[in-house]
Interface confidence: low
């Protein structure tokens, strides 16, 4: 394992003195009810805290909450509550945070049950005034933000009403009646599934998708028998009912709606469902659940167009009953995902791509660490990390697999080592080459979390008794320190940092209790003079990611290209900077057929890299034919993986198939026809490092 | 507002050929698969021709393959039909339309009236 | 070749419910044969009503609703007014006979 801290390690001088004097404690004059914290901004430094306390009496619930706000990224607070006149914020809603730098802010507040509408609290310069305005209707959801215009917003009402503002809540339009599930599209378009007949929840396979692009003056339906819909990069996808309405199939647009074909996927019953793991402009990783409760399913992964799928992973772990996957994407390293698999004996087992989903391998368990109870073979065994999965069945796993694009190749995980998941107390792992290797970095479990682009890690124990110890790593994990930051322990809540891993600030979240009392409290520490200077050329070492055999020549390729970085070397201790850009250099690689996906009608046999046609198109591709679009059936087999860059080598050039000869009558009537997708077990490769971790783009 | 607007019916003798034009307006014409349908003097309505997005795939009941040809210009948003050894069964007024599948709805144009007699 | 069969008259009266059918001689008629629903006024007006089983083209009244019935595809015209009185053809379609249409509904609305 990583050096501890008795051992010989490169210790940070001085230490205790430094953060002392970067200490800031901030009481809270506060009964502990709930507490909830919203950055505003980027690079700000401006932190709303909301805490609230509930009184249930006997016919109604007493409440009261407070805000607060800093503008020194959690040194100090002030109350701001008169600004929102001592009014009852209703938690559920969160504070909805207007997208970049907008600085706007939108509270609502909980109304007596009388009233003809809601409430909600306006600002819009970060926080400093706030605006009450009374709503025409009861809001069900947060206000939602058009992502172009933050002035922009759209909100659902209790009566299924869909309401949009244009001045940023001051004035309310209700633009559609019976409106199920609504979301804002790109360019200022909304899409929303209707019932005409008024019902959500018994209705669903029979809801009408609708689009409109200039706010409700009109609407165009773009597909109808929907059961759910879901936004992914440029996808729009709409899962919808077929055959004698048990089933449904998925049917994507790259238009906004306007064109649609089938996607070339199975189809699912009613107990079954369809998920967008992770999309963005160039593909998507789609899971389908299997029938019955089996708790798992297969991925696809799409080409450029979202309609033709290759198997990528079966047996993907996807409860049916809450809906947990361990499905993760390492943004520090392109192309890289974990998850985790149901095996044969029911044991769950983490894997790993680094080439978009291609493949999946186990992850290798650190050089010295011993193979676990669970290991038939103690001298074989992999790394297992616990995400999702493992937080809902209640194991001891306080934070999910962590990583950021800028702290290249970093990535930290509770996990286990052995031949499944444990049970057991797990410990926290850290890879620095995005999951290629590991170390065993803390014992037990952790909350941590990133700063200063990977300059520092922080970690505290996840204990239930209360703590007054963080532990910190300017070395990527080997090599960690303690410190003490207040003589009277608090119980732990919460770490909190700013987005995006840029900052050096860090703000523990608790509660002191004595005897008669309990009060928020809140413990910002400023690493700034850990790194006192800035990093320089001479701090950095040039990385080749993904790189397996520095020998071959494609060492790296990984989508076609390769790419060098210049990383913070371990020994330095020294400042990123909040304006630190990650600096790569990438090469094209050359072609191989891992760089294609077999295209419509042709699949991979197994253990196979060509391509084969299929001898006869299945199930609905006739109506692919005709209704779908004319350039997806001349193909010679073969298609780039969406964002692969290869050039040269091998070009699978062979004579071109016109599939259209087989859109001919000769076809299965309907009633025998059946949809199975022949999934070609294509290689594939990485994104573009977009996806939030454990963010899950659509659910049906 | 989608349009669809026929042309070039007219009354033609038995063995005679007329081609019909389709104007399309209004909807992504190269995204659709398109139809000829005629209706009969009896009312009957028969599907006629249809032709895929691109105009590379076509498909005919029996009654007039091999004598009618469909075909579209898409960047001028323009479907045509091409008849050939007409028949006196052939008379119908001639509908251009865009039938539907699964996810869109159908429109048709006005008509234009074939008159095949000698 | 499949026949599609239709009612041949239908009346109904302002403000009521009727609905229409669509019989497909191979079976049940299924989502795949994608029903089309299409009305015929006088001077060969004709309208696309339904697409694809259920789809109401833009601009349709919402009394209109496309569905199945039993092994039948139908439309149902909720509160009928005297300008829905006209001809209604449904079309069927086939992956071996492409777009096959009924004889028609001539649908009477009592004035």
């Known amino acids: 394992s990583a050096p501890g801290e008795d051992e010989e390690c490169g210790r940070v001088r001085d230490f205790v003195a430094k953060l002392a004097n970067n200490t800031h404690q901030h009481v809270f004059d506060d009964l502990r009810g709930s507490v909830s914290l919203s950055w505003v901004g980027d690079s700000t430094g401006v932190i709303l805290v909301l805490t609230t306390f509930h009184v249930p009496l006997v016919i109604m619930t007493f409440g009261q909450s407070k805000l607060y706000r800093s503008e020194d990224y959690g040194k100090n607070f002030k109350d701001i509550t008169d600004l929102i006149n001592n009014t009852f914020i209703r938690t559920e809603f969160g504070m909805a945070i207007g997208p970049e730098n907008s600085g706007k802010v939108v509270l609502t507040a909980e109304v007596s049950g009388g009233s003809r509408g809601g409430r909600i609290f306006r600002s819009s310069d970060f926080a400093k005034n706030f605006v009450q305005t009374d709503l025409p209707f009861h809001p069900l959801t947060q206000m939602m933000y058009s992502p172009q215009n933050s002035d922009y917003l759209l909100a659902l009402s209790t009566e299924n009403g869909l309401w949009v503002s244009k001045n940023f809540g001051g004035k309310w339009e209700e633009i559609h009646k019976t409106v199920c599930l609504a979301k804002w599209g790109r360019k200022g378009t909304i899409f929303f599934t209707a019932n005409h007949n008024g019902s959500c929840s018994n209705d669903r396979g029979m809801l009408e998708l609708e689009r409109t692009t200039d706010y409700g003056k009109s609407f165009k339906t773009v597909a109808s028998k929907i059961y759910s819909f879901g936004l992914g990069g440029k996808f729009l996808f709409a899962s919808v009912m077929t055959g004698k309405g048990t089933l449904r199939a998925i049917h994507v647009s790259v238009d906004d709606g306007d064109t649609w074909n089938m996607a070339q996927l199975p189809p699912v019953g009613h107990e079954q469902f369809y998920s967008i793991l992770a999309a963005n402009d160039e593909m998507v990783f789609m899971h389908v659940d299997e029938p019955g409760d089996s708790g798992f399913g297969t991925i696809y992964v799409s080409d450029d167009r979202g309609t033709v799928y290759s198997k990528s992973l079966e047996r993907h772990l996807y409860t049916t009953t809450g809906g947990e996957t361990d499905f993760i994407n390492v943004t520090s390293l392109r192309g890289v995902f974990t998850t985790s698999i149901l095996a044969e004996d029911k044991s769950v087992q983490s894997v790993i791509s680094f080439d978009q989903g291609g493949e999946w391998v186990p992850l290798r368990k650190p050089a010295d660490s011993k193979c676990d109870a669970t290991a038939r073979d103690p001298e074989k065994c992999s790394l297992h990390i616990h995400a999702a999965y493992s937080i809902a069945t209640g194991l001891n796993v306080p934070m999910l697999p962590l990583s950021e694009p800028n702290a290249v190749g970093l990535v930290l995980a509770h996990g286990s080592v052995g031949d499944a998941i444990s049970v057991m107390r797990p410990d926290v792992y850290v890879s620095d080459d995005g999951g290629y290797t590991w170390i065993k970095a803390l014992e037990g479990p952790h909350y941590y979390t990133i700063l200063d682009s990977g300059g520092i890690i922080v970690a505290i124990e996840h204990s239930s008794r209360p703590i007054n110890v963080i532990k910190f790593s300017t070395d990527e994990g080997q090599c960690w320190q303690t410190y003490t930051f207040t003589r009277d322990p608090i119980y732990f809540t919460g770490l909190a940092s700013e987005p995006g891993a840029r900052s050096m600030n860090i703000s523990i979240w608790g509660f002191t209790e004595s005897f008669l009392t309990s009060q928020w409290v809140s413990y910002t520490i400023d690493f700034k003079d850990i790194l006192e200077r800035n990093c320089e050329e001479k701090d950095y070492t040039i990385w080749l990611a993904h790189s397996t055999d520095p020998e071959d020549y494609e060492d790296g390729c990984i989508l076609g290209y390769k790419e060098q970085f210049l990383r913070l070397r371990k020994s330095s201790v020294c400042q990123n900077g909040r304006d630190y850009v990650v600096t790569k250099q990438p090469s094209i690689c050359l072609c191989s057929l891992e760089d294609f996906l077999c295209d419509f009608g042709y699949y991979r046999p197994e253990n196979d890299s060509k391509c084969v046609e299929q001898p006869e198109l299945k199930g609905h591709d006739l109506e692919f034919c005709l209704y779908g679009r004319e350039e997806h059936l001349t193909t010679n087999g073969y298609r780039k993986i969406p964002g692969d860059k290869c050039q040269g080598g091998v070009n699978p050039v062979r004579e071109v198939k016109d599939l259209k000869k087989k859109c001919t009558s000769n076809f299965l009537s309907p009633e025998k026809q059946n949809s199975k997708s022949n999934g070609s077990a294509g290689g594939s490769g990485g994104l573009n490092d977009i996806f939030e971790a454990q963010k899950i783009e659509w659910h049906e | 507002e989608v349009q669809l607007v026929e042309s070039g019916g007219d009354l033609v003798k038995p063995g005679g050929s007329l081609k019909l034009s389709c104007a399309a307006s209004?909807?992504?014409?190269?995204?659709?698969?398109m139809s000829w349908v005629r209706q009969t003097p009896d009312k009957r309505l028969e599907w006629v021709a249809i032709?895929?997005?691109?105009?590379?795939?076509?498909h005919y009941p029996d009654s007039v393959k091999g004598r009618f040809t469909i075909s579209r210009d898409n960047a001028k948003n323009t479907l045509y039909l091409q008849m050939s050894s007409l028949k006196s069964e052939d008379t119908a007024m001639y509908y251009c339309?865009?039938?539907?599948?699964?996810?869109?709805?159908?429109?048709w144009g006005q008509g234009t009236s074939v008159t095949v007699s000698s | 070749q499949a026949v599609v069969t239709q009612e041949s008259a239908l009346t109904t009266s302002p403000g009521e419910t009727v609905t229409l059918t669509c019989r497909s001689s191979t079976g049940a008629v299924t989502t795949s044969n994608y029903a089309n629903w299409v009305q015929e006024k006088p001077d060969h007006l004709f309208t696309g009503l339904i697409g694809g089983t259920n789809n109401r083209a833009p601009g349709v009244p919402a009394r209109f609703s496309g569905s199945l019935i039993g092994d039948k595809a139908a439309l149902t015209i909720t509160g009928a007014q005297t300008e829905d009185e006209a001809i209604y053809f449904c079309?069927?379609?086939?992956?071996?006979?492409?777009?096959?249409f009924g004889g028609g509904t001539k649908l009477t609305v009592l004035g």
């Open positions: 032709i895929s997005s691109g105009g590379s795939y076509t």
């Open positions: 079309a069927l379609w086939y992956s071996n006979h492409f777009w096959v």
């Open positions: 339309a865009r039938l539907c599948g699964p996810l869109c709805s159908g429109y």
């Open positions: 209004g909807f992504t014409f190269s995204s659709y698969g």
